[in-house]
Interface confidence: low
Amino acid sequence: IPTEIPTSALVKETLALLSTHRTLLIANETLRIPVPVHKNHQLCTEEIFQGIGTLESQTVQGGTVERLFKNLSLIKKYIDGQKKKCGEERRRVNQFLDYLQEFLGVMNTEWIIES
Amino acid sequence: IPTEIPTSALVKETLALLSTHRTLLIANETLRIPVPVHKNHQLCTEEIFQGIGTLESQTVQGGTVERLFKNLSLIKKYIDGQKKKCGEERRRVNQFLDYLQEFLGVMNTEWIIES
């Protein structure tokens, strides 16, 4: 897959592939994978991709199922790149506070918070 | 502060405190703090709280500004707890795929993705 494919298109294609190969992927009845118990997915990217690795090692490769795992590894690459950008630029306190305020604002309105 | 305060209320109070103490916090003109360059905040919690630590060490404590940093440390505690819950429960492949699909769905609709 060319890495030039826009990430948004990559995600859409991966969702379609996941749907297509679901039956094959769930064939292993005994396999157990850690699943996060909340919906703040971005906090759990490491565990999600560890789970994908476990699944890949247990799945017969070939055809479009291989493309699914290739896509997922490109998505991981994108997320790793985003994580690198978390601490790349040093800015004034003012700008840091803007980001902190935005983060808390998003946490306040969009996170699924259990008290 | 009692940790029994619901996290949602804690976040709201922290936003108010941050607003009130902004002038005091930006007093240090020379301080530079790493600021993420994208809006997928959850990926950057580690860097955000490192920045808060830097800011705290440079801020004259006392009164409600102390409460601000106490609140922020409670929010960090909550997020750390959420991160622990990322890999706590081992489930069937079926349930993992549900979560993965949900994650990709959220990424597809809610993430700010630069190609």
Epitope: L104, G105 | K12, E13, L15, A16, L17, S19, R22
Partner: nanobody
Amino acid sequence: QVQLVESGGGSVQAGGSLRLSCAASGNTFSFSTYCMGWFRQSPGKEREGSLATIYDGSTAYAGSVKGRFTISVDNAKNILYLQMNNLKPEDTAMYYCAAAKYCMFWSDPSYWGQGTQVTVSS
């Protein structure tokens, strides 16, 4: 267009009290969904940071007014209040109310009022 209008300012002796009000014109504006605050600007000085902030029931105060000033909001009437007790000459200033999403007054103020003058004499 939403406008914030302050009232209740005036002249008072040190130790006295005043209650400032801030009303919004425009039916679409609801105080309950905004972060609301009071600011002040003394003659010849820059506008100070927020004196008091209220956001969805949570309040915060600057050290200089804590224990003397109380911020509150009447969501039904869409009015923001600032009860000022034990006033000091250094409280003399033009007082402004402001509204913003997520309390981001400095980088993204949504609405500002025109201000109401408070004068405290010794």
